[in-house]
């Protein structure tokens, strides 16, 4: 392991569309990949009238946008589908939304997912 880097070996897995996709609904997913590539966890969710609906969680590929992020945080302003990624085992268990706004101070909207 490289000093100071959290290596990702497994992530929380969730698929809201599990019946159609014929996968498990939830579990722990081992993350594979080439030895020279970094691995990450991700979470995607929707905000339907203030209610959080998780879409997918799992392992993600080597992505510079995820490097050295121990927390899973979406920074885009009001996307249709929220996405965050992070490094470290099961780092996608919790995710949050901190929109990057030019003028106003970002507000914390932490989410602790509770899959059905």
């Amino acid at each position: 392991a490289i000093l100071g880097r959290s290596e990702t070996q497994e992530c929380l897995f969730f698929n809201a569309n599990w019946e159609k996709d014929r996968t498990n609904q939830t579990g722990v997913e081992p993350c594979y990949g080439d030895k020279d590539k970094r691995r990450h966890c991700f979470a995607t969710w929707k905000n339907i009238s203030g209610s959080i609906e998780i879409v997918k969680q799992g392992c993600w590929l080597d992505d510079i946008n995820c490097y050295d992020r121990t927390d899973c945080v979406e920074k885009k302003d009001s996307p249709e589908v929220y996405f965050c990624c992070c490094e470290g085992n099961m780092c996608n268990e919790k995710f949050s939304y901190f929109p990057e706004m030019e003028v106003t101070q970002p507000t914390s909207n932490p989410v602790t997912p509770k899959p059905p």
């Epitope: 996968t23 997918k56 992505d63």
Partner: antibody, heavy 119, light 107 residues
Framework: EVQLLESGGGLVQPGGSLRLYCAAS????????MSWVRQAPGKGLEWVSA????????YYADSVKGRFTISRDNSKNTLYLQMNSLRAEDTAVYYC????????????WGQGTLVTVSS | DIQMTQSPSSLSASVGDRVTITCRAS??????LNWYQQKPGKAPKLLIY???VLQSGVPSRFSGSGSGTDFTLTISSLQPEDFATYYC?????????FGGGTKVEIK
């Protein structure tokens, strides 16, 4: 070096069957999901089918569901596509491609094998 | 199924030109958008995944952007070897779908 080599293509009559093979090397085959993608002459890419690394989960495009069956033998590092009830519109170059995890892209592709369905 | 619409279907450009190809998804696909390059008689090659991440070995003149439903592939300065057909693809759904392709031809 990652290599994917398709075989089994050829000329078949409408209603006939064909089995395609994809021999994989240079990576841990069982750790990757695999897909078949086809391209009709002069047309774009069409995803056909996919299978998880373990082989437990399979997925099909509506256009081939019930006629094609994807399978794999991880001990032989080989992916298969059994094609039954073939139609003229199934004529295409068939590519196999690997995918690390379900939301990932298809990062390596074979060179393809041509299937021609004609009487 | 998620539909992917690419435009234009073809374009003519000269070496050194800046080229932009767009791809629209019929529903939000987050960052699960990939771009491929295909040359005649060859297999497709992965260029970009996750909207903007360059696959190993892909020149930095290629870039990707967008989010949600609207995405863009940009070639900052077209090179002779870039004349090819480009496809977008969504991997948000387990049932993959590709755009119809954009053929980049020499003007």
């Amino acid at each position: 070096e990652v290599q994917l080599l398709e075989s089994g293509g050829g000329l078949v009559q409408p209603g006939g069957s064909l089995r395609l093979y994809c021999a994989a090397s240079g990576f841990t085959f069982g750790a990757y999901a695999m897909s078949w993608v086809r391209q009709a002459p002069g047309k774009g890419l069409e995803w056909v089918s996919a299978i998880s690394g373990s082989g437990d989960d399979t997925y099909y495009a509506d256009s081939v569901k019930g006629r094609f069956t994807i399978s794999r033998d991880n001990s032989k590092n080989t992916l298969y596509l059994q094609m039954n009830s073939l139609r003229a519109e199934d004529t295409a170059v068939y590519y196999c491609a690997r995918q690390l995890i379900p939301p990932a892209p298809l990062d390596y592709w074979g060179q393809g094998t041509l299937v021609t369905v004609s009487s | 199924d998620i539909q992917m619409t690419q435009s234009p279907s073809s374009l003519s450009a000269s070496v050194g030109d800046r080229v932009t190809i767009t791809c629209r998804a019929s529903q939000g696909i987050s960052r699960f958008l990939n771009w491929y390059q295909q040359k005649p008689g060859k297999a497709p090659k992965l260029l970009i995944y996750g909207v903007s991440v360059l696959q190993s070995g892909v020149p930095s003149r290629f870039s990707g952007s967008g989010s949600g439903t609207d995405f863009t592939l940009t070639i900052s300065s077209l090179q002779p070897e870039d004349f090819a057909t480009y496809y977008c693809q969504q991997s948000f759904s387990s049932l993959f779908t590709f755009g119809g392709g954009t053929k980049v031809e020499i003007k």
